[in-house]
């Protein structure tokens, strides 16, 4: 046999570092809040720059803040750090050099926040531990390069771990709607999914990229429909489903992030809608999860007479294309419309709600606007 000198080995570290900031901890301590994201981004950039200014530029893969904790003097950031070194390198030397780069190069870091380079501690962890930390963070996914897809109506199939928060809601064993995992015991879906069938005992939620076989299954304990939802109107089309027992987070199944109520997604933002729904109007649901790339359309355009003629309320958003190329369809209802931030963390922007047929010109998909109902979610779940 022969030695492959170009083979690389991944090194995963759990890292902590202290910093001070004039922001109150309460402002950024809550995971996935605007301030959490901003603070995380700053710290991750500092770490990235530390490596980029060192001989280890090629070895650095990524850093990700997973949480903050308060200290007597300042705040402790908990981060995952991933590097790749030639397999011939001595592991102990690698650990020392990584620690050294952080100690030395973080001294040049320009704040805010003000980082204490000498506070940096790193601990090597294995892949299983790394995955566990990542899976407990919201909005992380095993990314695959996302090609332009057509529609879920004819779009692209998904691989395991790509959209781990997607759930299928089944009534008496038959897929009826999509849903999104927002923590270990709660799903968010559309209110209209439960207008006919209400008994939670006969609903099940399954997880994974196929309905049969599924990765995981749970019964529902209860269903909460927004008090202002009135069928057949589409306004306030949101529901929550409590699982009979929590799901353990894995690479294939974990939660999405919920945006702050104040967050504004912008027209033109690229988003993804996923589901097990039909490939054409009035078609059959699919066993394998599909994805479609869509673009956020502003409410004014969507409310034009040739589109939805003022039917779009502040609790709704439109996404797709006015040409009718991409859309969700029957059976996708209740499922997620997601958008990623600069850190590649995914947020729930919308819930598949309604539309005039599927992928019809001038009739984009209409989604429940999650930010508009964010406080309602908190009031019912505490999330």
């Amino acid at each position: 046999h022969y030695v492959r000198y170009n083979q690389k080995k991944t090194y995963n570290y759990y890292s902590t570092l202290s910093f001070t900031t004039d922001k109150l901890y309460a402002e950024f301590g809550r995971e996935a809040s605007n301030n959490f994201t901003e603070m995380s981004q700053r710290l991750e950039s500092m770490v990235k720059n530390a490596f980029y200014k060192s001989p280890l530029r090629e070895e650095f893969v990524k850093s990700q803040v997973i949480k903050f904790s308060q200290q007597k003097h300042g705040v402790l950031a908990h981060m995952l750090l991933i590097c790749r070194f030639h397999s011939t390198e001595d592991p102990e030397t690698v650990d020392k050099i990584v620690q050294l780069v952080l100690h030395e190069k973080l001294q040049d870091a320009v704040g805010p926040p003000k980082v204490d380079p000498h506070s940096v501690k790193i601990k090597k962890i294995n892949k299983t531990e790394t995955d566990s930390y990542l899976n407990h963070c919201c909005g992380t996914r095993r990314s695959k390069t996302l090609g332009q897809s057509l529609r879920i109506v004819g779009g692209t199939e998904v691989e395991e771990g790509e959209w781990p928060w997607q759930a299928s809601l089944q009534w008496d064993g038959s897929h009826r709607c999509g849903a999104t995992l927002i923590n270990a015991t709660w799903l968010v879906s559309a209110a209209h999914c439960f207008t006919t069938y209400k008994n939670p005992a006969r609903w099940t939620a399954s997880f994974g990229v196929t309905i049969k076989p599924s990765k995981m299954k749970r019964g529902l304990r209860r269903i909460i429909v927004h008090e202002k939802y009135k069928h057949p109107s589409h306004d306030y089309d949101i529901s929550l489903a409590e699982l009979s027992s929590p799901v353990p987070y894995t690479n294939a199944v974990h939660r999405v992030c919920l945006p702050d109520a104040s967050y504004e997604f912008q027209p033109g933002d690229v988003m993804f809608v996923t589901g097990f729904g039909a490939l054409k109007n009035d078609g059959y649901s699919q066993n394998h999860l599909r994805q479609a790339q869509v673009t956020l359309i502003d409410a004014t355009t969507c409310n034009e007479p040739q589109a939805y003629n003022d039917a779009i309320t502040p609790r709704m958003l439109c996404a797709g294309s006015l040409e009718g190329k991409t859309d969700a369809c029957q059976g996708d209802s209740g499922g997620p419309l997601v958008s990623s931030d600069a850190r590649d963390i995914w947020y729930l922007a919308g819930i598949v709600s309604w539309g005039d047929e599927c992928a019809k010109p001038n009739k984009p998909g209409v989604y429940t606007r999650v930010t508009a109902l964010r406080d309602w979610i908190t009031s019912k779940t505490g999330i």
């Epitope: 006919t196 939670p200 005992a201 304990r221 209860r222 909460i224």
Partner: antibody, heavy 122, light 107 residues
Framework: QVQLQQSGAELERPGASVKLSCKAS????????ISWVKQRIGQGLEWIGE????????YYNEKFKGKATLTADKSSSTAYMQLSSLTSEDSAVYFC???????????????WGQGTLVAVSA | DIQMTQTTSSLSASLGDRVTISCRAS??????LNWYQQKPDGTVKLLIY???RLHSGVPSRFSGSGSGTDYSLTISNLEPEDIATYYC?????????FGSGTKLEIK
């Protein structure tokens, strides 16, 4: 308020069929399932089946398949149950019941009709 | 089918008594259990849903508890209008099934 008004008592010959009605008022008829429940004189309650008036979806207790047929008429907000090939075993009071709400925990059969007595006798 | 067993078919109690009626399921019904009251005139009313939730308009002297396969209905302070037959019912699995009933009488 929610009301379920059932049709009057029926006296039928063995082998005949009978159609019972349950007129709903005080709510949107298509929004809730209606179940039918049998109670033989001095006995307990037995679930026959249910109908979802929005799409006429029906679910039956295996024991009553072929005996009971559930239908619903949206225009008159009325649910019906037809019992066929009547025998003395079908002599009972039949109730219709509407499920409760879903803004929290599911309520089951929250509203009941007054019941219809069916007597089968030669 | 899930069998619901109410072992006490009738019980006698005095006004003001605390009365407990039990119900056992042949398998776990995951708290999807209701209690109904049927008055001597035949009218049926929902009392308790999802094991322990009081239906609107039902007096607070009624309460429910239990989990898994064992459930109970308690009337804390028996009143004359509580004379009725009480049925448990599971809605965890089709077909929905009822207990055989417990007839409550005044001593």
């Amino acid at each position: 308020q929610v009301q379920l008004q059932q049709s009057g008592a029926e006296l039928e010959r063995p082998g005949a069929s009978v159609k019972l009605s349950c007129k709903a008022s005080g709510y949107t008829f298509t929004s809730y399932a209606i179940s039918w429940v049998k109670q033989r004189i001095g006995q307990g309650l037995e679930w026959i089946g249910e109908i979802y008036p929005r799409n006429n979806d029906t679910y039956y207790n295996e024991k009553f398949k072929g005996k009971a047929t559930l239908t619903a008429d949206k225009s008159s907000s009325t649910a019906y149950m037809q019992l066929s090939s009547l025998t003395s075993e079908d002599s009972a009071v039949y109730f219709c019941a509407r499920e409760g709400d879903y803004y929290g925990d599911y309520e089951g059969f929250a509203y009941w009709g007054q019941g219809t007595l069916v007597a089968v006798s030669a | 089918d899930i069998q619901m067993t109410q072992t006490t078919s009738s019980l006698s109690a005095s006004l003001g008594d605390r009365v407990t009626i039990s119900c056992r399921a042949s398998q776990d019904v995951r708290n999807f259990l209701n209690w109904y009251q049927q008055k001597p005139d035949g009218t049926v009313k929902l009392l308790i849903y999802y094991t322990s939730r009081l239906h609107s308009g039902v007096p607070s002297r009624f309460s429910g508890s239990g989990s898994g396969t064992d459930y109970s209905l308690t009337i804390s302070n028996l009143e004359p209008e509580d004379i009725a037959t009480y049925y448990c019912q599971q809605y965890s699995n089709l077909p929905y099934t009822f207990g055989s009933g417990t007839k409550l009488e005044i001593k």
